[in-house]
């Protein structure tokens, strides 16, 4: 009897998640089962299901399967958090790249290589054809999506809506082209799920056909999601166990990223004089083991043969014969030149001591000369002399080299928010240091805040179409989702960056968050064609006390008719009093039957002193805050609006002048709203965008 194939490997798992159908017309099929594998087999074969199964949920508590003809990207559906549920989505329907000739491609690209819209498969206009959905069952000839039902050479194609062009291939990349890794791929978290010879990978949470020790729950930081290629054990490149019982494991064909920028949260801190942690980041020149025996060169095979070569372990700095820790051992080590002693630890290298005395800075800390050498996020500072090239990239004068000694926190670029340093961690290239301003220091960090010298608008004009506000005008509005529900607003200020508030992040687990762009309805109803759902890859917290967060998207947003960026004001600028502004949000409206549509409230700018009076003198506003009062009594931002923008117009240019943060109740009559003044933090925002690497689209 032929062994039934285990198809669960064809699904992407989202733990603690289920799908709720908003559209009652959508069908669901349920049945009691024992395992998720049984659900998967039935979904793949569509056995006994009155629809094409695209996803299923396994209810672990009730031991029940729920099969769906839709997935999380479908319209009329929303994700919901639930401990007892696991969502499995067929990868073919969510993959945006092809494997081989793309026969299994079931994605939603519907535009040809030259940009022509595809003709629906069920239509005979403008081109008559025989590729009817009914004739090609299982090939998913839905809508006008690109497909390759016969597995032809060029990859997925479609008949075009242009009567002059009968058909054309679609420009869908090979998965092996899209996926790339840095170094030896230890930080790779991509979606490659087959080996270089084309074998399908075994799920990490399965023990068949091959038993193994790499259980996801035992190694939560190794990215053991589904059956994607990973490098948890310091191999030369990512690999996986295969579904072939005769091939235990194989490497995966993942190319090296062009710019080779690392994007790993676990990048070790580079040190040269001492060992931090297990010394994986040690880059010093000690070249003997603890008892003085010299090390063997890493590029030599004498006296000991090995595969720890510089070619196999890129980015591990296996230069000369220096002690290193390329494989996650307990500390730096090397092969020795003594034929009788293969390896030895270099335990004579001291541990780094990150202790520091307490101190403070005055003004913006440009004259701070203390010896703190650690960032507020706990990272050790890296040497200034190693980072001069980066520093020159974002300042336009020669920094005072006499101040930039060792790796101490300094402020060579006149940053308004205090001393900082480079870290040696590519994910967090630099950060502020945990030093406070000296008590009683009142030196302003921006001068002339109350004199409207600097205009907020840059010189370029905003394009207004016939002067009619359209949905395009709010394309920068972001709905931040926490566990599949709207939690906060945000503003898209760059394709990969969203400006929002610190208060919007109950959890530090980035998998709990998503950004929805291009929507008008908070549930995404009616926004399917324009909605973009993006994961969050990093949170960059603003300077101490700012309440700001820059949220980096896992991939850049695609700017189109529904998604656009909004401009930032000039640093330290002042907007004239009574300027008309607006706040936007999907938050609490005071209405019982809230329709979920984006709301706007119109406010006008109020000077800080006048604002303080309106708050009965109980509030003293500082240079980092901006005040705006409501034109209509009792309107203004509230819960769910936090993180969203205060948008003002100057010289026909719209800008995000403020960020909504919680504080003093919602829309209290005669109490103007107090927002974070974006102009005060504009240099910080630009510095982050300039220096933090963004993912390639």
């Amino acid at each position: 009897q032929r062994k039934r194939r285990n198809t669960i490997h064809e699904f992407k798992k989202s733990a603690k998640t289920t799908l709720i159908k908003i559209d009652p017309a959508l069908k669901i099929k349920t049945k009691k089962v024992n395992t998720a594998d049984q659900c998967a087999n039935r979904c793949t074969r569509n056995k006994g299901l009155p629809f094409t199964c695209k996803a299923f949920v396994f209810d672990k508590a009730r031991k029940q399967c729920l099969w769906f003809p839709f997935n999380s990207m479908s319209s009329g559906v929303k994700k919901e958090f639930g401990h007892e549920f696991d969502l499995y989505e067929n990868k073919d329907y969510i993959r945006n790249c092809i494997i081989g000739k793309g026969r299994s491609y079931k994605g939603t690209v519907s535009i040809t290589k030259s940009g022509i819209k595809c003709q629906p498969w069920s239509s005979m206009i403008p081109h008559e054809h025989s590729f009817l959905p009914s004739s090609y069952r299982g090939k998913d000839l839905q809508e006008n999506y690109c497909r390759n039902p016969r597995g032809e050479e060029g990859g997925p194609w479609c008949f075009t809506s242009n009567p002059e062009v009968r058909y054309e291939v679609c420009d869908i990349p090979q998965c092996s082209e899209v996926e790339c890794m840095t170094c030896n791929g230890e930080s790779y978290r991509g979606l490659m799920d087959h080996t270089e010879s084309g074998k399908i990978c075994q799920r990490w949470d399965h023990q068949t056909p091959h038993r193994h020790k790499f259980l996801p729950e035992r190694y939560p930081d190794k990215g053991f999601d589904d059956n994607y290629c990973r490098n948890p054990d310091g191999q030369p490149r990512p690999w996986c166990y295969t579904l072939d019982p005769h091939t235990r494991w194989e490497y995966c064909a993942i190319k090296t990223c062009a710019d080779n920028t690392m994007n790993d949260t676990d990048v070790p801190l580079e040190t040269t004089e001492c060992i931090q942690g297990q010394g994986e980041g040690y880059r010093g020149t000690v070249n003997t083991i603890w008892n003085g025996i010299p090390c063997q060169r890493w590029d030599s095979q004498y006296p000991h043969e090995h595969d720890m070569t510089p070619e196999n372990f890129k980015c591990k700095d296996l230069r000369e014969n220096y002690c290193r820790n390329p494989d996650g051992s307990e500390s730096p080590w090397c092969f020795t030149t003594d034929p009788n002693i293969r390896v030895g630890y270099c335990s004579q290298i001291p541990n780094c001591d990150m202790s520091h005395g307490q101190d403070c800075y005055r003004g913006n800390g440009k004259n701070y000369m203390g010896n703190l050498s650690q960032t507020r996020s706990g990272l050790t500072c890296s040497m200034w002399d190693k980072n001069m090239e980066d520093l020159h990239r974002h300042i336009f004068w020669e920094p005072d080299a006499s101040k930039l000694n060792e790796n101490y926190c300094r402020n060579p670029d006149d940053d308004a928010h205090g001393p900082w340093c480079y870290t040696g961690n590519p994910l967090i290239p630099w950060d502020y240091c945990p030093i406070s301003r000296c008590e009683g220091d009142t030196t302003p960090t921006i001068v002339n805040l109350d004199h409207p010298v600097i205009s907020c608008a840059k010189t370029k004009q905003l394009r207004v179409v016939n002067g009619i506000p359209t949905r395009t005008n709010i394309g920068w509005m972001v709905s931040l989702r926490y566990r599949n529900k709207h939690i906060c607003g945000g503003s898209l200020i760059k394709e990969s960056w969203v400006l929002t508030a610190r208060q919007c992040f109950p959890s530090r687990d980035l998998k709990d968050y998503e950004a929805w762009l291009g929507i008008h309805d908070v549930h995404g109803r009616g926004d399917e064609k324009c909605k973009q759902v993006l994961n969050v890859s990093q949170l960059v917290y603003g300077p101490e006390g700012s309440d700001l967060v820059l949220m980096k998207l896992a991939r850049p947003a695609v700017l189109d008719d529904f998604v656009s960026t909004i401009d930032l004001p000039n640093y330290g600028c002042t907007i004239p009093e009574k300027t008309s502004c607006s706040v936007y949000g999907w938050g609490y409206t005071g209405l019982i039957n809230y329709d979920g549509l984006l709301r706007v409230a119109h406010l006008y700018i109020m000077g800080n002193e006048k604002c303080s009076q309106h708050h009965r003198g109980k509030v003293t506003l500082n240079e980092s805050e901006i005040c705006a009062g409501a034109e209509k009594i009792g309107s203004g931002p509230c819960e769910g609006d936090y993180g969203g923008p205060l948008v003002c117009e100057q010289h026909k240019m719209r800008m995000v002048l403020g960020v909504i943060v919680p504080g003093r109740g919602c829309a209290i009559p005669n109490r103007p709203g107090i927002f974070v003044r974006v102009a005060y933090y504009a240099k910080w925002i630009h510095k982050i965008i300039l220096t933090y690497k963004v993912p390639q689209s």
């Epitope: 930081d221 507020r376 529900k485 610190r502 530090r508």
Partner: antibody, heavy 115, light 110 residues
Framework: SLEESGGRLVTPGTPLTLTCTAS????????MSWVRQAPGKGLEWIGI??????NPDYASWAKGRFTISRPSTTVDLKITSPTTEDTATYFC????????????WGPGTLVTVSS | AYDMTQTPASVEVAVGGTVTIKCQAS??????LAWYQQKPGQPPKLLIY???TLASGVSSRFKGSGSGTQFTLTISGVECADAATYYC????????????FGGGTEVVVK
């Protein structure tokens, strides 16, 4: 600074509400936690209230037994039906940084549950 | 569930000595771990946050390290004033938590 109030001697089953008041910062801008400590025992995290429409999170043992709320400019902890095991000093704390640690604590208020 | 286990429950140390307290998380919490010091009749006081960053006004004799699931607090050159109970606390996630704090370690200075 922070100050807790409302701690007193109550009989089992009598609901009790503790209040946390802030001075020197705007309480509405921060997540706030409640923590308790029974005499001679360690710190026990009860729960946290966020600044937005997300429901408060509670320790698994505290669900249903406590309710955290934000009436205007204070943060309240309601012990719904106290038992003798709820005798403890109750602290409120401001959650700072990246919302990941408590940087300001109140001095605590003592609740004694006894019949 | 992000539960915290602290060891030892109690430790005795001589003035000038070094004491090491360990804290283990049931799941990876990156570096979102804080250490607090509590003396009898007082609320806890923040010592270290983000696993290794010293809080304002805290002596550099206190040192935190670790990431993922294993963390350490080291007090070197112990002084009489260091006699207290020390607690670790995870700040990675607040949902589905039994106790965000470790059980505590009492440091007795001889």
């Amino acid at each position: 600074s922070l100050e807790e109030s409302g701690g007193r001697l109550v009989t089992p089953g009598t609901p009790l509400t503790l209040t946390c008041t802030a001075s020197g910062f705007t309480i509405g801008r921060y997540y706030m936690s409640w923590v308790r400590q029974a005499p001679g025992k360690g710190l026990e995290w009860i729960g946290i209230i966020y600044t937005h429409g997300v429901n408060p999170d509670y320790a698994s043992w505290a669900k249903g037994r406590f309710t955290i709320s934000r009436p205007s400019t204070t943060v309240d902890l309601k012990i719904t039906s106290p038992t003798t095991e709820d005798t403890a000093t109750y602290f409120c704390a401001r959650v700072g940084g990246f919302n990941d640690y408590s940087d300001i604590w109140g001095p605590g208020t003592l609740v004694t549950v006894s019949s | 569930a992000y539960d915290m286990t602290q060891t030892p429950a109690s430790v005795e140390v001589a003035v000038g000595g070094t004491v090491t307290i360990k804290c283990q998380a049931s799941e990876s919490i990156s570096t979102y771990l804080a250490w607090y010091q509590q003396k009898p009749g007082q609320p806890p006081k923040l010592l270290i946050y983000r696993a290794s960053t010293l809080a304002s006004g805290v002596s550099s004799r206190f040192k935190g390290s670790g990431s993922g699931t294993q963390f350490t607090l080291t007090i070197s050159g112990v002084e009489c004033a260091d006699a207290a109970t020390y607690y670790c606390q995870q700040g990675y996630s607040y949902s589905n938590v039994d106790n965000a704090f470790g059980g505590g370690t009492e440091v007795v200075v001889k």
